[in-house]
Interface confidence: low
């Protein structure tokens, strides 16, 4: 009887062979059958499952001139770049007249050098700080034993001896390279070499040494930097803002910070050109030849109030009999703090100086004692903050009031019976 027509007789005359090889290998499985009549489509099974997207080709050769004669059918399954997922039992399958025929199995196995699933990665670490590196490899054949190398020197005497998938490094003091070797019965594969760059540790104990209205002196303790000396430290200051929300871990301020570099040692820096009576946040990082440390957390600091940098402006002083009317305007120069008020001093040629605290008003009427015959009366005004008095104005002579000159009504201020204090006159 013709092949393929009886249930007990398989049409297959050639079954798939076996392939065993390393990852990436290209190979071909073949099966051959002889059938009578129209050739069937050959399907491939892997571990009993039909391969829907198999890279197979089918060749059909007639053995006679009539379509009903026998045909030789050859199906070739190409495996390109052998992977672990390709391994298993392979068979050909055909449907012939309501009956299914399956070839004898062939086997595809993977056996070669170890294959890395995970390799050590480049990273930066702070000096003397523990970290872990990972390496993972597989066969087949198993087992796969790992051997870690640091700067090309093995960290154990044999594969599988010592740390395996995870290498715990208790700390480094110099930039080092790490790799791992994976060993199995077929040989050795070496991973990529990871460079672990040793950076300085984050500086510690950032603190204020002294404060001036427009400058802050800060100091810090440098962290360890391994065998690499620190080349410099960088300090950043940024204006604080209630809405800014610089938290301990927030990486960057919302505006361009004021950046200063300090040569080291000493681990100290004077930050100038700051605003008085202003909150700032500062942080520091130190750099070696290998790169910069991480920044410290932001430290809130504040410049103190200063005294006003200039005297009150546009002072005028007029006299009418026993009364003197003085008024002025706020200093144009920076106040360096919160203006608390003004001090006024007046003095005649042969009379003691009189000092008065005017408060925040910018005008005052003085009630002069005596008959008003004091000669060469002059007035000075200074603004003050919580930090103290600003510079005094130049002495302004008291001018006689001329009829027609407006003189508003002011609250009279009696001079104190004794001066509040005295300072060297101009």
């Amino acid at each position: 009887a013709p092949r393929g027509t009886q249930a007990e007789e398989s049409p297959f005359v050639g079954n798939p062979g076996n392939i065993t090889g390393a990852r990436g290998l290209t190979g071909t499985l073949r099966c051959q059958l002889q059938v009578q009549g129209e050739p069937p489509e050959v399907h491939w099974l892997r571990d009993g499952q039909i391969l829907e997207l198999a890279d197979s080709t089918q060749t059909q050769v007639p053995l006679g001139e009539d379509e009903q004669d026998d045909w030789i059918v050859v199906s070739q399954l190409r495996i390109t770049s052998l992977q672990l997922s390709d391994t298993g039992q392979y068979q050909c399958l055909v449907f012939l007249g309501h009956q299914t025929f399956v070839s004898q199995p062939g086997y595809v196995g993977l056996e070669g050098l170890p294959y890395f699933l995970e390799e050590p990665e480049d990273r930066t670490v702070a000096a003397n700080t523990p970290f872990n590196l990972s390496c993972q490899a597989q066969g087949p054949p198993e087992p796969v034993d790992l051997l870690w190398l640091q700067d090309a020197v093995p960290l154990a005497t044999a594969p599988g001896h010592g740390p395996q998938r995870s290498l715990h490094v208790p700390g480094l003091n110099k930039t080092s390279s790490f790799s791992c070797e994976a060993h199995n019965a077929k040989g050795v594969t070496t991973s990529r070499t990871a460079t672990i760059t040793v950076l300085p540790q984050q500086p510690r104990n950032l603190h204020l040494v002294s404060r001036q209205p427009t400058e802050l002196e800060v100091a810090w303790t440098p962290g360890l930097s391994g065998i690499y000396p620190l080349t410099h430290c960088t300090l950043q200051a940024v204006l604080s803002d209630d809405g800014m929300g610089i938290q301990a871990g927030e990486p960057d301020p919302p505006e361009e910070p004021l950046t200063s570099q300090a040569s080291v040692p000493p681990h100290q820096l004077r930050l100038g050109s700051l605003h008085p009576h202003t909150p700032y946040h500062i942080r520091v990082a130190c750099t070696s030849s290998q790169g910069p440390s991480s920044w410290t957390h932001w430290l809130p600091v504040e410049t103190p109030e200063g005294v006003p940098l200039g005297p009150p402006e546009n002072i005028s002083a007029t006299r009418n009999g026993s009364q003197a009317f003085v008024h002025w305007q706020e200093p144009r120069a920076p106040l360096q703090g919160t203006l608390l008020g003004y001090r006024l001093a007046y003095q005649g040629q042969d009379t003691p100086e009189v000092l008065m605290d005017i408060g925040l008003r910018q005008e005052v009427t003085l009630e002069l004692q005596g008959d008003g015959s004091v000669s060469n009366l002059t007035v000075c005004v200074a603004a003050y903050t919580a930090a103290g008095d600003g510079p005094w104005s130049l002495p302004v002579p008291l001018e006689a009031w001329r009829p027609g000159q407006a003189q508003p009504v002011h609250q009279l201020v009696k001079e104190p019976s004794t001066p509040a204090f005295s300072w060297p006159w101009w």
Partner: antibody
Framework: EVKLVESGGGLVQPGGSLKLSCATS????????MYWVRQTPEKRLEWVAY????????YYPDTVKGRFTMSRDNAKNTLYLQMSRLKSEDTAMYYC??????????WGQGTSVTVSS | DIVMTQSHKFMSTSVGDRVSITCKAS??????VAWYQQKPGQSPKLLIY???TRHTGVPDRFTGSGSGTDYTLTISSVQAEDLALYYC?????????FGSGTKLEIK
């Protein structure tokens, strides 16, 4: 039975050289990493060198690096330690040892090296 | 280098007693510790590796334990033939280093 037998020790002057051998039997020599370990007169154990099973990789601590060379002949199942520029602190009993997967599982009986003028 | 410290140079015990020999590593060696026994006039012999795994043929009165930096070799019932020097060794990092040894004396 695993056997390791060292030979070649003796008295040598400082600056001199000596070559130790370790003949092995009872196991597949080419499958194992091997060591030399020494024991000082004060009974301290110091690891001196190791060699990979194929002989392609050797490693030495700083105390002997550049002066000692370890080698092996897998065809003869023999291990060697060439020692040069010897110092008095190299005086010790020298053992060869086999590395199992995790530790030095078999040691020879040792050969004594004395460096003295 | 990793330093292995055996704080007791000598330990005196009696036959049948339980004795523990300790060893401390200068850093975590993740149980990669071996113990060796050296009897007078003999070469060292491996007792324990990977902190607690007994080598072939080692009597079960010898047990190893520990993790991190602290390791112990315990002899549950000392026999006269256990008179020896005992060394610990780390096989975690090259260079491999040994402890200075503990001499077990039988009263």
């Amino acid at each position: 039975e695993v056997k390791l037998v060292e030979s070649g020790g003796g008295l040598v002057q400082p600056g001199g050289s000596l070559k130790l051998s370790c003949a092995t039997s009872g196991f597949t020599f080419s499958d194992y990493y091997m060591y030399w370990v020494r024991q000082t007169p004060e009974k301290r154990l110091e690891w001196v060198a190791y060699i990979s099973n194929g002989g392609g990789s050797t490693y030495y601590p700083d105390t002997v690096k550049g002066r000692f060379t370890m080698s092996r002949d897998n065809a003869k199942n023999t291990l060697y330690l060439q020692m040069s520029r010897l110092k008095s602190e190299d005086t010790a009993m020298y053992y060869c040892a086999r590395l199992s997967f995790y530790a030095m599982d078999y040691w020879g009986q040792g050969t004594s090296v004395t460096v003295s003028s | 280098d990793i330093v292995m410290t055996q704080s007791h140079k000598f330990m005196s015990t009696s036959v049948g007693d339980r004795v523990s020999i300790t060893c401390k590593a200068s850093q975590d060696v993740t149980t990669a510790v071996a113990w060796y026994q050296q009897k007078p006039g003999q070469s060292p012999k491996l007792l324990i590796y990977w902190a607690s795994t007994r080598h072939t043929g080692v009597p079960d009165r010898f047990t190893g334990s520990g993790s991190g930096t602290d390791y112990t070799l315990t002899i549950s019932s000392v026999q006269a033939e256990d008179l020896a020097l005992y060394y610990c060794q780390q096989h975690y990092r090259i260079p491999f280093t040994f402890g200075s040894g503990t001499k077990l004396e039988i009263k």
